[in-house]
């Protein structure tokens, strides 16, 4: 399992550490979550052939996973710090229901799935502090999330496996795009 952020998981600027800065905490947190996703993806890919499947598009149509687009201002072309930060936080909040869905989807990596979920909650808190002046952040509706969760859990086995694979892949891509953009803030 990856080392929790704040422990010796990464090169540090000095042997006697000052408390982590806000940007360093965020950076470490994202990398920690990405390590967790890699471990979960390994189990998913070993367990089924979803990672090589060409039928992803069929399942993807039923999911509304957050995705970075040009208009979000998180790419090098048209980078906009405020717009991008709102998108990152909003996207992470939208991912929470999907991370909840993942909780009963793993056998040997059950703890890892929980760690990814909890670490994402912490990351959202870090980012909300950074964006304290931004009021454009919308929180997903709990009722909508509850019915989505029920719908996902009612899928057949094949679709559940595919959904798990797609959530992990999309979350990894979203976090990598976020990490790239946050380096410019």
């Amino acid at each position: 399992a990856p080392v929790p952020p704040g422990e010796d998981s990464k090169d540090v600027a000095a042997p006697h550490r000052q408390p982590l800065t806000s940007s360093e905490r965020i950076d470490k947190q994202i990398r920690y979550i990405l390590d967790g996703i890699s471990a979960l993806r390994k189990e998913t890919c070993n367990k089924s052939n979803m990672c090589e499947s060409s039928k992803e598009a069929l399942a993807e149509n039923n999911l509304n996973l957050p995705k970075m687009a040009e208009k979000d201002g998180c790419f090098q072309s048209g980078f906009n710090e405020e717009t991008c930060l709102v998108k990152i936080i909003t996207g992470l909040l939208e991912f929470e229901v999907y991370l909840e869905y993942l909780q009963n989807r793993f056998e040997s990596s059950e703890e890892q799935a929980r760690a990814v979920q909890m670490s994402t909650k912490v990351l959202i808190q870090f980012l909300q502090k950074k964006a304290k002046n931004l009021d454009a952040i919308t929180t997903p509706d709990p009722t909508t999330n509850a019915s989505l969760l029920t719908k996902l859990q009612a899928q057949n086995q094949w679709l559940q496996d595919m959904t798990t694979h797609l959530i992990l892949r999309s979350f990894k891509e979203f976090l990598q795009s976020s990490l790239r953009a946050l380096r410019q803030m």
């Epitope: 540090v12 600027a13 940007s23 790419f75 090098q76 790239r180 380096r183 410019q184």
Partner: antibody, heavy 117, light 107 residues
Framework: QVNLRESGGDLVKPGGSLRLSCAAS????????MAWIRQAPGKGPEWLST????????DYADSVRGRFSISRDNAQKSLYLQMTSLRPDDSAIYYC??????????WGRGTMVTVSS | DIVMTQSPSSVSASVGDRVTIFCRAS??????VAWYQQKPGEAPKLLIY???SLQSGVPSRFSGSGSGTEFTLTISSLQPEDFATYYC?????????FGQGTRLEIK
């Protein structure tokens, strides 16, 4: 005009140490991540290390981790690379570069480091 | 680490030719690729970022395309100043890695 200028390259014996410097001008240095990249003769560039704008986030390539140390002084608009336990395969042109979204949009002209007995 | 493999290692062409250089990533990196041009005795110069975005000041005859693991740099009509070595670089994640280069020579 945006400019990066490296200095400190030299001929050094195996096991020796060297400190490279990079002076920046023409842009707001404290706003950018900065990196060191080297290129051995006839080879492609090799990324070595990146430091965040405030100096709190540092990454190293496995090939230099534990031997090289990156640092910066925003007041002086300078970037540094402290190199220890140098080996012959560390011989290369060392470039300082400005990183933007994991690519490098501004490069210095480079400084030559030769490790030989 | 993500390995970037360029092909061909060298190519000969004439002024006015259309030239395409290829780069393959060892894993899916979406469109996070940069392309550089390097002339002898000079530092690399950024041409393309994010797979297809032209860096400011770079002539429009240079273009980039591709996503996932396969990428291309195209020079639509070679000019004398374009003879140089070209490198791809994955800008997806650290450790940042470069291709081994493609040398563009005069035929």
């Amino acid at each position: 005009q945006v400019n990066l200028r490296e200095s400190g390259g030299d001929l050094v014996k195996p096991g020796g140490s060297l400190r490279l410097s990079c002076a920046a001008s023409g842009f707001t240095f404290r706003k950018y991540y900065m990196a060191w990249i080297r290129q051995a003769p006839g080879k492609g560039p090799e990324w070595l290390s990146t430091i965040s704008n405030s100096g709190d986030i540092i990454d190293y390539a496995d090939s230099v981790r534990g031997r090289f140390s990156i640092s910066r002084d925003n007041a002086q608009k300078s970037l540094y690379l402290q190199m220890t336990s140098l080996r012959p395969d560390d011989s290369a042109i060392y470039y300082c570069a400005r990183e933007y979204f994991f690519s490098f949009d501004v490069w210095g002209r480079g400084t030559m480091v030769t490790v030989s007995s | 680490d993500i390995v970037m493999t360029q092909s061909p290692s060298s190519v000969s062409a004439s002024v006015g030719d259309r030239v395409t250089i290829f780069c393959r990533a060892s894993q899916d990196i979406r469109n996070w690729v940069a392309w550089y041009q390097q002339k002898p005795g000079e530092a690399p110069k950024l041409l393309i970022y994010d797979g297809s975005s032209l860096q400011s000041g770079v002539p429009s005859r240079f273009s980039g395309s591709g996503s996932g693991t396969e990428f291309t740099l195209t020079i639509s009509s070679l000019q004398p100043e374009d003879f140089a070595t070209y490198y791809c670089q994955q800008s997806d994640s650290t450790p940042i890695t470069f291709g081994q280069g493609t040398r563009l020579e005069i035929k």
